[in-house]
Interface confidence: low
């Protein structure tokens, strides 16, 4: 990226751009990682790998887990299946809006949207409509920073995921993720 | 150094069009958002459109949506503000604005701070 | 469409005094939210983004802060430069709205 002429901003933690790159990062390797696990490579997916430092990788393996929990969660999958892909960015904005439409944020909340969004790219790709793996991502960045970056500064950043899910009962925080994307595609159903 | 430089304006009819250009220095076009932003005469800002040019995504204001375009030209890094049907309630400063940079490529419509703008430029719209 | 309901639409201080202008949002806007600087005939200045951080060479004295659906541009101790008019900017869901401006003046 040609970044001249940009000054650099704070970089701690629970700053903007901090929370805004790390969760970049997350949301690129989570993406990368369930697609990897359809077999086969998906070049639409080969975006450049970033570095990540060690706290970005036990976020990554944090979010990994709950992804494969998700993914055997029968019911969440049926849902998502039954999604209609011909206006993706309505869908995604509607069901994104309504995870959090009750003005409680959790951070099992943020990750059901992270894998809400990794199910509309692995859509999108059995469909063939690569162009809108990046513009999803786009969507769910933009989702983050305009509804969801103000609470992650309060959680003191992204490290307070893994305390979130670092406990024994992280199954059944699962659960409950899976019971709020659940949720929010069937009101999207009832509304579509 | 980043510079925006804005052009086209100018005195136009009722009904006319105008094609106001942004000319960006300094920075890619492509990883940015660019805005456009109005003035009327002794009131306050008003945002009219944006784009992210790296998904060709454009968002408007109701006021001018139908009427007005924006397009980027990447090879040219210039930003475009095509106005149809001009009304005299157009009649304002127009600037174009830089908005947040994308992240590893892949930012979003980047509706965001504007951190640098250009010095506008006046569009009248009278008979 | 979010609203931004800025307030005081006009203020007279003295150099040296504490100023404080806030934004309602109509509704959540979480940290989009921007402070820009206007002086007449020129065009605005980003001051600060994420409702809270400062701008690169931004002064000190100028800091944003965030209670629910209210956002407040502080300058801590305002100087003569400072005289001009303040404009709050949301951004939600790619539509931008801007506040309708708070002009600061010699008293």
């Known amino acids: 990226m040609d970044g001249s002429g940009e000054q650099p901003r704070g970089g701690g933690p629970t700053s903007s751009e901090q929370i805004m790159k790390t969760g970049a990062l997350l949301l690129q390797g989570f993406i990368q990682d369930r697609a990897g696990r359809m077999g086969g490579e998906a070049p639409e997916l080969a975006l450049d790998p970033v570095p990540q430092d060690a706290s970005t990788k036990k976020l990554s393996e944090c979010l990994k887990r709950i992804g494969d929990e998700l993914d055997s969660n029968m019911e969440l999958q049926r849902m998502i299946a039954a999604v209609d892909t011909d206006s993706p960015r309505e869908v995604f904005f509607r069901v994104a809006a309504d995870m959090f439409s009750d003005g409680n944020f959790n951070w099992g909340r943020v990750v059901a949207l992270f894998y809400f969004a990794s199910k509309l790219v692995l859509k999108a790709l059995c469909t063939k409509v690569p162009e809108l793996i990046r513009t999803i991502m786009g969507w769910t960045l933009d989702f983050l920073r305009e509804r969801l970056l103000g609470w992650i500064q309060d959680q003191g950043g992204w490290d307070g995921l893994l305390s979130y899910f670092g406990t024994p009962t992280w199954q059944t925080v699962t659960i409950f993720v899976a019971g709020v994307l659940t949720a929010s595609l069937t009101i999207w159903k009832k509304m579509g | 150094e980043v510079q925006l430089v804005e052009s086209g304006g100018g005195l136009v009819q009722p009904g006319g069009s105008l094609r106001l250009s942004c000319a960006a220095s300094?920075?890619?076009?492509?990883?940015?958002?660019m805005h456009w932003v109005r003035q009327a005469p002794g009131k306050g800002l008003e945002w009219v459109a944006s784009?992210?040019?790296?998904?060709?995504?454009?968002y408007y204001a109701d006021s001018v949506k139908g009427r007005f375009t924006i397009s980027a030209d990447t090879s040219k890094n210039t930003a475009y503000l095509q106005m149809n049907s001009l009304r005299a309630e157009d009649t304002a400063v127009y600037y174009c604005?830089?908005?947040?940079?994308?992240?590893?490529?892949?930012?979003?419509?980047?509706?965001?701070?504007?951190?640098?703008w250009g010095q506008g430029t006046l569009v009248t719209v009278s008979s | 469409d979010i609203q931004m309901t800025q307030s005081p639409s006009s203020l007279s201080a003295s150099v040296g005094d504490r100023v404080t202008i806030t934004c309602r949002a109509s509704?959540?806007?979480?940290?989009?939210v921007a402070w820009y600087q206007q002086k007449p005939g020129k065009a605005p200045k980003l001051l600060i983004y994420s409702a809270s951080s400062l701008y690169s060479g931004v002064p000190s004295r100028f800091s944003g802060s965030r209670s629910g659906t209210d956002f407040t541009l502080t300058i801590s101790s305002l100087q003569p430069e400072d005289f001009a008019t303040y404009y709050c900017?949301?951004?939600?869901?790619?539509?931008?709205?801007f506040g309708q401006g708070t002009k600061v003046e010699i008293k």
């Open positions: 604005a830089r908005g947040g940079a994308y992240y590893f490529g892949y930012y979003g419509s980047g509706s965001y701070a504007m951190d640098y």
């Open positions: 900017q949301q951004s939600s869901y790619s539509l931008i709205t």
């Open positions: 509704q959540s806007v979480s940290s989009a």
């Open positions: 784009i992210s040019p790296y998904y060709g995504y454009t």
């Open positions: 300094g920075f890619n076009l492509s990883y940015y958002s």
